[in-house]
């Protein structure tokens, strides 16, 4: 008679994280008595992943009657599987004896799993930056098999081409993770803007995983000044106003200087927002030129979302009739308020 | 549901031969090892042996090699296991356990003169 | 034959505290043939870690179990009073299958 010969006839199977694995193994004689055994992996160190007759194999189970004396098939079914299940399977035939010893294997079946990704991740920095400067936002997707990925980064549809990605780890692997850095220069113009992060990989079937970062977490917009003189209100009052504009985020707080003496003090509240997402906000003093024997410089300091104050001020004359006048400096915050000055 | 029913509580005198049924249910008995385990008062468990119930083929630890029988009936779903040459340490509770998983409830054998 | 010993043979501990019971095997034994049960009193064993390092249906995620060649481990993270119990480690990696002498892991 013919000897027996182990068939594994699936050199490799493929399956989703999640779905039961089949594999299978069929006998071509019942000669010699023995049972059938299933490993993963060769060598001393294989693992056992069926036994027929004892142990505890909770996520296995036999597709068909194996333990019926004429029965020739032993395929397996192994249920929820997860990218720890990946490896090469063998069907091993074993012979009765004291102790049982192993009369052949089969070729084995390679089972590899498809694992889908995790939804990617997006980080910025921890700090606001200004326009113009350039800031990394990292995304990470992990959990994911086969190695194969594309990952690809978007600013509001345009796609980014300054990044770096890493797919770890290097060698095989039941599953990979994938890191990667974008370089991203801000504009004025990205309070609204978002960063995206999209993954393509084989078990998302054409519709990409997306992880986003809105730059309004990230971008700080310091604001223009404008100190102005309007016209004569009444009889010796003058009306200064500091026009603070084009700023973002909203925290802004505002300071009136009199000749270099703190005046008020006062905090955005009522700004009105731009299109691009920026915030305006104007503050006024009611100056009574009466009160003034010399010149008065009058100083609008703005500090703006916890950065160095800026300023803008305004030299008011006092000894003629006043005049519009204005010298700059820089600029920083807002407010809206009216204050006498006596 | 995998059952395993043990036989009642029995007290032999030394010398004496003693044998234990094990029924089970929720399953083929030819499907799996019955294993037995020895377990002396306030003293851990001891392996006794096995049999295979396809085939009756037996494994018997070195230490119970002679005095132990195991067999099986597999148009009962039944497994045994008989001691014979009782002597006083073999007082134990005795379990049936299938292919390692499921256990019996025990039997409790006295060996008293 | 291999022996299997355990130790300690008694751990003493509060609810909340974690506990590492070890199984030392005379000779190498295959993961997949380390298997630890749990016993009450008056009660049969329960199959409580197979295969090394899984859990069996039902036991809670504090337990876990490790190890490879001679040396093993059950641990719990974090004891609950219905922990307390005795443990054993059991080998069928070879003829004749054996069990460790058991750990009693009382209440301090």
């Known amino acids: 008679e013919e000897e027996l010969q182990v068939i594994q006839p699936d050199k490799s199977v493929s399956v989703a994280a999640g779905e039961s694995a089949i594999l299978h193994c069929t006998v071509t004689s019942l000669i010699p008595v023995g049972p059938i055994q299933w490993f993963r992996g060769a060598g001393p160190a294989r693992e056992l992943i069926y036994n027929q007759k004892e142990g505890h194999f909770p996520r296995v189970t036999t597709v068909s009657e194996s333990t019926k004396r004429e029965n020739m098939d032993f395929s397996i079914s192994i249920s929820n599987i997860t990218p720890a299940d990946a490896g090469t399977y063998y069907c091993v035939k074993f012979r009765k004896g004291s102790p049982d010893t192993e009369f052949k294997s089969g070729a084995g079946t390679e089972l590899s799993v498809r694992a889908k990704p995790s939804a990617p991740v997006v980080s910025g920095p921890a700090a606001r930056a200004t326009p113009q400067h350039t800031v990394s936002f990292t995304c990470e997707s992990h959990g994911f098999s086969p190695r194969d990925i594309t990952l690809k980064w978007f600013k509001n549809g345009n796609e980014l081409s300054d990044f770096q990605t890493n797919v770890d780890p290097v060698g095989e692997s039941v599953s990979y993770s994938i890191h990667s850095t974008a370089k991203v220069v801000l504009t004025r113009e990205d309070v609204h803007s978002q960063v995206i992060c999209e993954v393509a990989h084989v078990t998302l079937q054409g519709d990409p995983l997306r992880g986003t970062a809105n730059l309004s977490e990230t971008i700080r917009v310091p604001p223009t000044l404008e100190v102005t003189q309007q016209p004569v209100r009444a009889e010796n009052q003058v009306n200064v106003t500091c026009q603070v504009r084009k700023f973002y985020p909203q925290r802004l707080q505002l300071t009136w200087l009199e000749n270099g003496n703190v005046s008020r003090t006062e905090t955005a509240s009522t700004v009105t927002e731009n299109k691009d997402g920026t915030y305006n906000w104007m503050s006024w003093l009611l100056v009574n030129v009466s009160a003034h024997r010399d010149d008065v410089k009058l100083t609008c300091q703005v500090e703006h979302d916890g950065q160095p104050a800026v300023s803008k001020s305004h030299d008011l004359k006092v000894s003629a009739h006043p005049k519009e006048q204005g010298s700059n400096t820089a600029a920083e915050n807002t407010g809206s308020n009216e204050r006498n000055i006596y | 549901e995998v059952q395993l029913v043990q036989s009642g509580a029995e007290v032999k005198k030394p010398g004496a031969t003693v044998k234990i049924s094990c029924k089970v249910s929720g399953f083929n008995i030819k499907d799996y090892y019955m294993h037995w385990v020895q377990q002396a008062p306030g003293k851990g468990l001891e392996w006794i042996g096995r049999?295979?119930?396809?085939?009756?083929?037996?494994k018997y630890a070195p230490k119970f090699q002679g005095r132990v029988t195991i067999t099986a009936d597999t148009s009962t779903d039944t497994a045994y296991m008989e001691l014979s040459s009782l002597r006083s340490e073999d007082t134990a509770v005795y379990y049936c356990?299938?292919?390692?998983?499921?256990w019996g409830q025990g039997t409790l054998v006295t060996v008293s003169s | 034959e291999i022996v299997l010993t355990q130790s300690p043979a008694t751990l003493s501990l509060s609810p909340g505290e974690r506990a590492t019971l070890s199984c030392s095997a005379s000779s190498s034994v295959s993961s997949s043939y380390l298997y630890w049960y749990q016993q009450k009193p008056g009660q049969a064993p329960k199959l409580w870690i197979y295969s090394t390092s899984n859990l069996a249906s039902g036991i809670p995620a504090r337990f876990s179990g490790s190890g490879s060649g001679t040396d093993y481990t059950l641990t719990i993270s974090s004891l609950e009073p219905e922990d307390f119990a005795v443990y054993y480690c059991h080998q069928w990696s070879s003829y004749p299958y054996t069990f460790g002498q058991g750990t009693k892991l009382e209440i301090k």
């Open positions: 356990d299938r292919g390692l998983a499921y």
């Open positions: 049999i295979d119930p396809e085939d009756a083929e037996t």
